[in-house]
Each structure stands twice: as structure tokens, then as C-alpha cells.
């Protein structure tokens, strides 16, 4: 039994990182393999993480951290029963792919104007909280080549965007994701969608020439 | 050994400043957030605020923001708050603790007497 | 922010007999990441606090086998299970899930 790949690692830099190897053959990861993981501090001991399947002969491993400073770094040992088949260490703050924003929410009845709110993913006592932008991305479920993205770069967790940008009478879903530029992060993954239905009351003009595009709220 | 060697007592007036320190021997305090905790003369434990010494990114307690400011010197592996516009209710034993993730090793605490 | 409410404030217990504490908090302290940062801290007379119990229920190294942490919720507990004289001292719950972090006002524990 020889590691193929060797286990490359993404922190969330809060409580997990996630670890993904390669084995040269098929492989029950959960029963043959384990993955022992130490930070190199005073008190720390040893944990055992008991790797899943990922493909035939992929592995990937949850890695449970209690807390994480940017100087942290953590040995890494695969074994497989008494056999020690790959040595090395990581450094969650190098390698950082941030936990995906939530409670994504479209408010539609400010007049005009769509404002998008969601969750940050981190509390306020983790670095990442004030350091993260964002990409909301939104698209029509009608027709494929209405898809947009808006970077926010402020803090903030919310996007207004005035309704009439999109087209009216027919349905949207947005999602929103994060990265870090203090540490040069990954994009976290796509919060999950919402859709909503869009609609406005045209300017007036408009409302006088093209009446039947007029919607109501 | 690991220790954490707090700056001795101070005698402040009113409205003055003071700056404590904490050196860490042992440890590197990069590994570690730094902690302050105020303990007022025959009173209990009172979370003040923490530093992560390599960003220097701190988080305070509300009702200690604008008074205290946690400040770190990786060179010296040494955390310092400094306290500011002191007053009567500012006087306390404050200790600079280490947590990694819990609050293992405490400095022998520094007096701070406000008085006019 | 989390209040900390230590019961009771003191208690006087005969060596070799057992001592109860009770700490609950305002609202849940499991921390986004699963965990739950309940800490119990003993402070001597003169002393700097010194940790116990980390994590609800995990004695920290050195820590006699005396002392155990159990709860969840909101609800924690710390127990000796034969108190010695060496006991004595102020006994702090804290939290450590959620900014700002808190402690219990303190329960003095004598020796009668």
C-alpha cells in the first residue's frame, strides 16, 4: 500500500480543515488508514482522524481544530496499521478556503431597490470576520445568458441593487460566496440559492408607452 | 519552565495613563492569544480583551473599549495593554493570560492603584 | 452579553466530604465550531487562577481526579468528590464560546 498523491490541506481557519489524498489502488480509507495530526505547541496532543472514502482510491479527512493563529502549524502522519506511509505538516493560515456565507435573503419591498442580505461565517472573534468580500452572483432561471456577478470589497454583508437592472416579471436566484485577502484564501463554496420573482413599478414615461409591462408589487 | 512575568504595581492619578507588560518565557506567544483579566480588590474575574500577537488583531470587552488597548512585540515575545483616562473604579490586580485554546498559564498579576 | 450565574456564592464542607457547584449561563454557550469553551479556574488565597477543568468535562494535567466537570446547555456543574484543605479558594466558571467572553462571580469554598 503506497500513497499516490500526497495529502494536500484547506483550513476553514476556525474549527476544521479537510485533507484529500490519493492511495495507488482501491482503498477502504475508514479501516485501513488512519491520519494522526498534532500542533507543534506546549499542550497540544495528538488526534486521530479516521479517514472516508473519496472515490475509489481517494481519502479525505475532517481535521477538528479547537481554535487557530495565523503561526499555527500541525505535523501530519498517514499510517496504515503499523506502517508509517507519509510524514508531513501544514499550516492552516497559508492554505485557507473560508466557510461559505448563509441566511442568504432577497428583501423586495423596499421601493425600486432589491437588497440582498446574508450571514458572515465566522463570529466575531475570529481574524477572518473582518476581512472577508464578498461575490454575489445572480442569474435567470429563464434565460442562461442573464447571469451576473457583484463583488462587494466593503465589509458589510448586503448588496442593494436597484430592481430595474433585471428584467421584470420573471424569477431570479442569487448566491453569494467569500474569500480573504489577508490571506490570499480560495473562494469559499456558493452559499446555497434563493429566488425570488422580481417586479417594479416602471418610471412613469415608460408605464405611459409600454402599459403592459407595468407590474405591480 | 513556562512563565509569564507581569511588570510590577503602579500608582496613577486621575486621568493619567499606564502601560503594563507581559513577557512570556518558555513559549512563543505567536502560538498563542494573549488575554487580560481585571480582578478589582476583593472582587472577581473580569474579561478584558485578547490579542492575536502575529496580526495584531484584537477583540475587546464593550466596556473596556476606548479604556484598554492590548498591543504585542513578537521580538520581545512580550504583551503590553495600556490603560487610559484612569479613574477610582480602574483599580485592580490585571493578569495577562495565555490561551491556547483555554486560559493554561496566567502572569503573577500587576497592581494598579488609582489615586489621587 | 453571557451571564454567568455561579451557585452558591460559599460553601463550608467538612474534609473528605463531597462540594457541588453550579454554574448556569444566560443562553447556549456550544460555540459555532460545536464545541463548548466551559472552563472551571480555582483561585488560591494570593494566588493567580489556575485551570482545572477545560471543555465542560476534561481535567487538566496535574489536576487530582477529585474534581470532574460534567453539564450541557446551559447547565454546568464542577464537583469534588472528597474535599481537602488544599481546596480552599474561589472557584470560577467561565465561558470562553462567545465574544465578549465571561466568568461566574466566584464561589469561596471553605474548609470547616
Known amino acids: 500500500m503506497k500513497v499516490l498523491q500526497e495529502p494536500t490541506c484547506v483550513s476553514d481557519y476556525m474549527s476544521i480543515s479537510t485533507c484529500e489524498w490519493k492511495m495507488n489502488g482501491p482503498t477502504n480509507c475508514s479501516t485501513e488508514l488512519r491520519l494522526l495530526y498534532q500542533l507543534v505547541f506546549l499542550l497540544s496532543e495528538a488526534h486521530t482522524c479516521i479517514p472516508e472514502n473519496n472515490g475509489g482510491a481517494g481519502c479525505v479527512c475532517h481535521l477538528l481544530m479547537d481554535d487557530v493563529v495565523s503561526a499555527d502549524n500541525y505535523t501530519l502522519d498517514l499510517w496504515a496499521g503499523q506502517q508509517l506511509l507519509w510524514k508531513g505538516s501544514f499550516k492552516p493560515s497559508e492554505h485557507v478556503k473560508p466557510r461559505a456565507p448563509g441566511n442568504l435573503t432577497v428583501h423586495t419591498n423596499v421601493s425600486d431597490t432589491l437588497l440582498l442580505t446574508w450571514s458572515n461565517p465566522y463570529p466575531p472573534d475570529n481574524y477572518l470576520y473582518n476581512h472577508l468580500t464578498y461575490a454575489v452572483n445572480i442569474w435567470s432561471e429563464n434565460d442562461p445568458a442573464d447571469f451576473r456577478i457583484y463583488n462587494v470589497t466593503y465589509l458589510e454583508p448586503s448588496l442593494r441593487i436597484a430592481a430595474s437592472t433585471l428584467k421584470s416579471g420573471i424569477s431570479y436566484r442569487a448566491r453569494v460566496r467569500a474569500w480573504a485577502q489577508c490571506y490570499n484564501t480560495t473562494w469559499s463554496e456558493w452559499s446555497p440559492s434563493t429566488k425570488w420573482h422580481n417586479s417594479y413599478r416602471e418610471p412613469f414615461e415608460q408605464h405611459h408607452h409600454h402599459h403592459h409591462h407595468h407590474h405591480h408589487h | 519552565e513556562v512563565q509569564l512575568v507581569q511588570s510590577g504595581a503602579e500608582v496613577k492619578k486621575p486621568g493619567a495613563t499606564v502601560k503594563i507588560s507581559c513577557k512570556a518565557s518558555?513559549?512563543?506567544?505567536?502560538?498563542?492569544?494573549m488575554h487580560w483579566v481585571k480582578q478589582a480588590p476583593g472582587k472577581g474575574l473580569e474579561w478584558v480583551g485578547r490579542?492575536?500577537?502575529?496580526?495584531?488583531?484584537?477583540i475587546y470587552a464593550s466596556k473596556f473599549q476606548g479604556k484598554a488597548t492590548i498591543t504585542a512585540d513578537t521580538s520581545s515575545n512580550t504583551a503590553y495593554m495600556e490603560l487610559s483616562s484612569l479613574r477610582s473604579e480602574d483599580t485592580a490586580v490585571y493578569h495577562c493570560?495565555?490561551?491556547?485554546?483555554?486560559?493554561?498559564?496566567w502572569g503573577q498579576g500587576t497592581l494598579v492603584t488609582v489615586s489621587s | 452579553d453571557i451571564v454567568m450565574t455561579q451557585t452558591p456564592l460559599s460553601l463550608s464542607v467538612t474534609p473528605g466530604q463531597p462540594a457541588s457547584i453550579s454554574c448556569r449561563s444566560s443562553?447556549?454557550?456550544?460555540?459555532?465550531?460545536?464545541?463548548?469553551?466551559l472552563e472551571w479556574y480555582l483561585q488560591k488565597p494570593g494566588q493567580s487562577p489556575q485551570l482545572l477543568i477545560y471543555?465542560?468535562?476534561n481535567r487538566f494535567s496535574g489536576v487530582p481526579d477529585r474534581f470532574s466537570g460534567s453539564g450541557s446547555g446551559t447547565d454546568f456543574t464542577l464537583k469534588i468528590s472528597r474535599v481537602e484543605a488544599e481546596d480552599v479558594g474561589v472557584y470560577y466558571c467561565?465561558?470562553?464560546?462567545?465574544?465578549?467572553?465571561?466568568f461566574g462571580q466566584g464561589t469561596k469554598l471553605e474548609i470547616k
Open positions: 493570560v495565555s490561551r491556547r485554546p483555554w486560559f493554561a498559564y
Open positions: 467561565f465561558q470562553g464560546s462567545h465574544v465578549p467572553y465571561t
Open positions: 471543555k465542560v468535562t
Open positions: 443562553q447556549s454557550i456550544v460555540h459555532s465550531n460545536g464545541n463548548t469553551y
Open positions: 518558555g513559549f512563543n506567544i505567536k502560538d498563542t492569544y
Open positions: 490579542i492575536d500577537p502575529t496580526n495584531g488583531y484584537t
